[in-house]
């Protein structure tokens, strides 16, 4: 079954078109923008989601200090090239023949160049640091309760096994969620940490990608956890290659 049988929709991706034209009249859903068939029992890849988004109408601290190679997605939205499996192609180019290399979450990891730019392989993002600031509350959340609820959220909403949630740090009002997933750890069927982080980011912004499921309602011991801002850092298995010009 590739989608909900009864009304033929995709619970995990509302940016799809679904129809009962799969094998044996089964419901099959295809991502907007690319037309790629998606598995509605799990998260859709970030690449296909970005493509669909671009095709849609425009409407002494315990906290971790990201290391020097951490990437932040400063380039914003672009219309990506995805491979047949829905992964980002290592080289991305725009309509004016400006090209750059990206990592597995689609974030630029080199200076921009021209069509002669080579990106030999898609470099895996194996460590993601999600940095959140929550709205003021009467008192700080209990750290272990917060930790447990966030781990359960990533497991039950984003289908990410807790073994990939490396740590949850908390220093009111800052929460940091560390996701780690090496190539060797990721088995067939495992959700990619990049996809889970993207779904979470969209949820936090009130732009849920889920169909028919309510928006994110995160509570810790009954107390709502409302996020004011999010910053996501990406660390790749191979450090990025930027010229010194960018670093100054």
């Amino acid at each position: 079954h590739t989608a909900a049988q009864d009304n033929c929709t995709c619970p995990t991706n509302k940016m799809t078109v679904c129809s009962p034209d799969g094998p044996g009249g089964r419901c099959q859903c295809r991502a907007l923008g690319s037309g790629v068939a998606v598995d509605c029992s799990t998260l859709t890849s970030k690449c296909l989601l970005l493509k669909a988004r671009m095709s849609a109408p425009k409407n002494a601290r315990t906290l971790v200090r990201p290391n020097e190679h951490a990437l932040v997605d400063n380039d914003g939205l672009y219309d990506p090239d995805c491979d047949p499996e829905g992964r980002f192609k290592a080289r991305q180019c725009n309509q004016t023949s400006v090209c750059w290399c990206v990592n597995s979450v689609g974030v630029r990891r080199t200076d921009k160049g021209d069509l002669s730019l080579r990106c030999d392989e898609l470099v895996r993002t194996h460590h993601i640091l999600i940095d959140l600031r929550h709205r003021p509350t009467a008192s700080a959340f209990n750290h272990s309760d917060l930790d447990a609820e966030l781990r359960r959220l990533f497991r039950e909403r984003y289908r990410l096994h807790p073994k990939f949630v490396a740590a949850v740090h908390y220093e009111q009002p800052t929460i940091q969620i560390e996701l780690r997933q090496n190539t060797s750890q990721k088995a067939a069927g495992d959700v990619d940490i990049g996809d889970a982080a993207y779904y979470f980011e969209r949820d936090v912004k009130g732009e849920s990608l889920f169909q028919g499921r309510g928006g994110l309602d995160l509570r810790v011991r009954g107390e709502p956890l409302q996020v004011e801002r999010t910053l996501i850092y990406y660390l790749d298995e191979i450090p990025p290659k930027f010229s010194m010009k960018r670093l100054t």
Epitope: P11, S41, D147, R152, K163
Partner: antibody
Framework: QSLEESGGDLVQPGASLTLTCKAS????????ILWVRQAPGKGLEWIGC???????TYYANWAKGRFAISKTSSTTVTLQMTSLTAADTATYFC?????????????WGPGTLVTVSS | YDMTQTPASVSEPVGGTVTIKCQAS??????LAWYQQKPGQPPKLLIY???DLESGVPSRFKGRGSGTDYTLTISDLECADAATYYC????????????FGGGTEVVVK
Amino acid sequence: QSLEESGGDLVQPGASLTLTCKASGFDLNNYSILWVRQAPGKGLEWIGCIYISGGSTYYANWAKGRFAISKTSSTTVTLQMTSLTAADTATYFCARDDGTASYYLNLWGPGTLVTVSS
Amino acid sequence: YDMTQTPASVSEPVGGTVTIKCQASEDIYKLLAWYQQKPGQPPKLLIYAASDLESGVPSRFKGRGSGTDYTLTISDLECADAATYYCQQAYTIGNIDNSFGGGTEVVVK
């Protein structure tokens, strides 16, 4: 790969008891362990769960406060039970998830019997 | 997320067919498992994700369903199928009393 429970006993009402689940042949850190019990002639009842990675614990509403799950070594998980009553008489099973994000239990121990009686 | 399983007991002859129903109080998005338990033994996972057969389980066992309604059908009943069957929602462990259905005893005549 296997799981084995131990520590089941005949105890008095009001007593406490700790059960142990020992894992063999696999890395516990890649899984979650759930405890399930079954009273004689009755159905399965979920007690609680521990995400080994991170150590977070979760309990059925009725089990909160009286039951506590913890990882005690690289191969063992315990279930501590307090203020036991006759209603807690059951076979207690530990089970492992299948390594996916769902709670499918594809490996179970044989169970250990706890009898609460005066 | 209460799981209501029916019937509590069913009796069918060898070669017959049995259908067990399981209803969740809320949508569990096909995250449902079926287990078989024989006396003195722990439960054994038969079906996961509502319809996927665990390795080694005969194709006579068939799971179906979505949303809140699920079924387990056992066809061509054999004596070895005599057991108690349980459904389990595998979607959440938050704020629940039990993730298992009440069980169905299958008697093979």
